[in-house]
Structures are given as structure tokens and as C-alpha cells.
């Protein structure tokens, strides 16, 4: 089931999924001057069986002879409102994603793809947050968010992370600014969750996560 809202925004932090649940969709976006081939796929889709998950469809970009005025399925990255890319210091560390059944690895790049990837997450997906360069983390709890579904409505849990500037006076837990409810929207109820998550196995995997390049976008 698609997660019909966006992971929370944490000031001075960015997030990354370490593996993608089956059902996740990745837009086939091309960089400026290129477009999807006429008969090309709109999305890649994480699919699989009990033993193996992989991305269906291949994204293909071709040169635009003239400026492409056709509206894309989603705006191109440079046309997105408040689109941000944050690069961390170290390259992505390898993660043993094969240990997560029902999940796909990060898809390999395709020729002339856009600089940022737009994913459509599904219920149960977990993303991990990290402070951007120049900020350090003050944790009150897990620096992750998971998409849950309650009464047919989806929401992301609130990551318990505050990113503070290294030159600023440290905030102690008792002095932290209040954040949004840990369970997202105030209207959400918690009495009838219909889905469970891969919390434990993904949390264990997150422990292996080093500083990464975070260029993932989402919808």
C-alpha cells in the first residue's frame, strides 16, 4: 500500500532508505536536456517473490533535440519547489541489503538520469535521518521514521533527532525545543494499526550505516 504523505522534515537533516520495500516506485527522471524515451517506463518498481526482490522495468533517457515542453509525470528536479540536495562527506558505505527479504537494493544509475531520485514509498518503509555537514545530532530516541497505516490513513512517525550547529551551545535533553507528535498528524489514531513494520531488522541494519551521500527525494 502506497504511503500517501511525505517523510517528516527535520531541520538541518536529511534521510535515506537503506533498502526499499517491495511495491516502492522510482520515477524515471532524466537530467536537463534529456527525456524519457517515447515507449519508456514511467517508473521502476520493486517486485519479488519469497526469495528474491529486484527492480522491474528499466529507465531510459534520450536527448531532447528541442526543449521538452511536455509536462513530466512529476516536475524535473530543477523545477521542483524548494528542492534540496545535501551531500555528506563520505561515500555511501556498502550495506548487506540481501539480509532484508522483500526489499530491493538501491537501483544502479542509468545513463543521463536526473541528479535526484524521486521515490514513492509504501507502508512499512523505514528511512534513516542524519544531520547535514556542520551539524551534530542530539538524540532523544531513534533517528528514523517509518510509514504506518491506521484506519486506512498513512503517516510517518516522527524521528527523535535534533541537529544543532557545532558552534552553538549544546542543548540538553531538558532544553530541547518541542517537536511534533511522535506519531505524526494529530488526527491519527493508534487503536487499529493494520500493518506491522520491519522495525527490528532494519534498526539492526541501521547500526552499520556510516555517513552517506543523501540525494534521495520522495513523494
Amino acid at each position: 500500500e502506497l504511503c500517501d504523505d511525505d517523510p517528516p522534515e527535520i531541520p538541518h537533516a536529511t534521510f535515506k532508505a537503506m533498502a526499499y520495500k517491495e511495491g516502492t516506485m522510482l520515477n524515471c527522471e532524466c537530467k536537463r536536456g534529456f527525456r524519457r524515451i517515447k515507449s519508456g517506463s514511467l517508473y521502476m518498481l520493486c517486485t519479488g517473490n519469497s526469495s528474491h526482490s529486484s527492480w522491474d522495468n528499466q529507465c531510459q533517457c534520450t536527448s531532447s533535440a528541442t526543449r521538452n515542453t511536455t509536462k513530466q509525470v512529476t516536475p524535473q528536479p530543477e523545477e521542483q519547489k524548494e528542492r534540496k540536495t545535501t551531500e555528506m562527506q563520505s561515500p555511501m558505505q556498502p550495506v548487506d541489503q540481501a539480509s532484508l527479504p522483500g526489499h530491493c537494493r538501491e537501483p544502479p544509475p542509468w545513463e543521463n538520469e536526473a541528479t535526484e531520485r524521486i521515490y514513492h514509498f509504501v507502508v512499512g518503509q523505514m528511512v534513516y535521518y542524519q544531520c547535514v555537514q556542520g551539524y551534530r545530532a542530539l538524540h532523544r530516541g531513534p533517528a528514523e521514521s517509518v510509514c504506518k497505516m491506521t484506519h486506512g490513513k498513512t503517516r510517518w512517525t516522527q524521528p527523535q533527532l535534533i541537529c544543532t550547529g557545532e558552534m552553538e551551545t549544546s542543548q540538553f535533553p531538558g532544553e530541547e525545543k518541542p517537536q511534533a507528535s511522535p506519531e505524526g498528524r494529530p488526527e491519527s489514531e493508534t487503536s487499529c494499526l493494520v500493518t506491522t513494520t520491519d522495525f527490528q531488522i532494519q534498526t539492526e541494519m541501521a547500526a552499520t550505516m556510516e555517513t552517506s551521500i543523501f540525494t534521495t527525494e520522495y513523494q
Partner: antibody, heavy 116, light 106 residues
Framework: QVQLVQSGAEVKKPGSSVKVSCKAS????????MHWVRQAPGQGLEWIGY????????LYNQKFKDKATITADESTNTAYMELSSLRSEDTAVYYC?????????WGQGTLVTVSS | DIQMTQSPSTLSASVGDRVTITCSAS?????MHWYQQKPGKAPKLLIY???NLASGVPARFSGSGSGTEFTLTISSLQPDDFATYYC?????????FGQGTKVEVK
């Protein structure tokens, strides 16, 4: 209580454009995506696309990507859908529906009639 | 795209009848959702995540199924239930609906 109130019926000439509005109240507008759904006379429901009001992100059904443009105005808690290059086949009732999962609240619908 | 095929397209029934509407998806989906629509009105959420009744929906409505085959059942049809019913999937984009099943008076 949650309410989605749409603009009134429109009669348009072929080739022209129309902009339908959907004013939301009773909840935090920016916390939920707004979806748009079309229903041609005597036909079923077709999903057009959505907007995330807080970021302006949009996603369209490929079928409508050259037909519809969805926008939102946070200051007035209003979502809009503009339909361009209208043809008689675009005659339909257009609904906005609150997202964030299943469509629990819908606008009353806006009938757009395209006729010469 | 995932195609949703409802059957029957039209169903003639009487008050008190047990009514069953089926919806087949062209690919496996995680959940099915159902909406009820009356003439000139917006659709109304009836059942979400396959089997959960939306707020205010009478217990005579029920939903079941998994994978590609799903069912909406009205155990004892009431006058207020004559309407068109749509199944809906939101497991993948584009979101799609069934073509509708009209429940009319026999």
C-alpha cells in the same frame, strides 16, 4: 468538521481552459495531499493526480499529464486544477479528495461541460 | 497500470437480499477499498483495507479477499443501499478504480 468546497459548474468552448478550485477547512491543509478524480457522464472514477500542498510536489496519471495542472495556495487552503485544450471528451464531474491514504473526504464535485 | 474488473456491472435485487460484488485486480495488491456513490453525489468511503468499515457504515456491509480477488457483501439489502459501488486500489500508481457495480431495484 472537515469540508472540501469546490467551485461551481462551468461551460467552456473547445480549445479553452478552465480552473476548478477546492477550498479545504476543518483540518491542517498542508498535512494531507489533495487528489483529483474525474467522472465522465455515466462512467466510473478516474484518478487524475495529486499535490502535496506544503511542498508543491505533484504527481499525475500519465493519461492526464498534458491535460491537467494541479496547484495549491497555502494561504487560502485552496487546491486548484486547471484543464487545458478542452475537448468534448473532457466533459465530466471533477472531484477533489483528501489524501493521506483512503479518500475519506470529497468535494461535492464540479461539472465542466465542453460544448461549442 | 493495475486494471480493476468488477462483476456484475449491474445487479438487480430486492430489499432483504444478500448481495455480493466481486472485484478482480490484474496484479496482486495489498488491500482493496470500496466506495458507495449515489446519483449526483460524491463517492463515500465504505470499506478500507479490505475489511474495515468506515465510520458510520452499518454492519451489514462486509469486505474480504486477498491478492487479486476481493468481495463486497451486503448481508441484507436495505432501501438506502441502492447505489453504485466502486472498488479501488492504492497499491501502485496510477491509482485505479473498478468500473462500478450498480445495485438497482429488481
Amino acid at each position: 468538521q472537515v469540508q472540501l468546497v469546490q467551485s461551481g459548474a462551468e461551460v467552456k468552448k473547445p480549445g479553452s481552459s478552465v480552473k476548478v478550485s477546492c477550498k479545504a477547512s476543518g483540518y491542517t491543509f498542508t498535512s494531507y495531499r489533495m487528489h483529483w478524480v474525474r467522472q465522465a457522464p455515466g462512467q466510473g472514477l478516474e484518478w487524475i493526480g495529486y499535490i502535496s500542498p506544503n511542498k508543491g510536489y505533484t504527481l499525475y496519471n500519465q493519461k492526464f499529464k498534458d491535460k491537467a495542472t494541479i496547484t495549491a495556495d497555502e494561504s487560502t487552503n485552496t487546491a486548484y486544477m486547471e484543464l487545458s485544450s478542452l475537448r468534448s471528451e473532457d466533459t465530466a464531474v471533477y472531484y477533489c479528495a483528501r489524501g493521506g491514504g483512503v479518500f475519506d473526504y470529497w468535494g461535492q464535485g464540479t461539472l465542466v461541460t465542453v460544448s461549442s | 497500470d493495475i486494471q480493476m474488473t468488477q462483476s456484475p456491472s449491474t445487479l438487480s435485487a430486492s430489499v432483504g437480499d444478500r448481495v455480493t460484488i466481486t472485484c478482480s485486480a490484474s496484479s496482486s495488491i495489498s488491500y482493496m477499498h470500496w466506495y458507495q456513490q449515489k446519483p449526483g453525489k460524491a463517492p463515500k468511503l465504505l470499506i478500507y483495507t479490505t475489511s474495515n468499515l468506515a465510520s458510520g457504515v452499518p454492519a451489514r456491509f462486509s469486505g474480504s479477499g486477498s491478492g487479486t480477488e476481493f468481495t463486497l457483501t451486503i448481508s441484507s439489502l436495505q432501501p438506502d443501499d441502492f447505489a453504485t459501488y466502486y472498488c479501488h486500489q492504492r497499491s501502485t500508481y496510477p491509482l485505479t478504480f473498478g468500473q462500478g457495480t450498480k445495485v438497482e431495484v429488481k
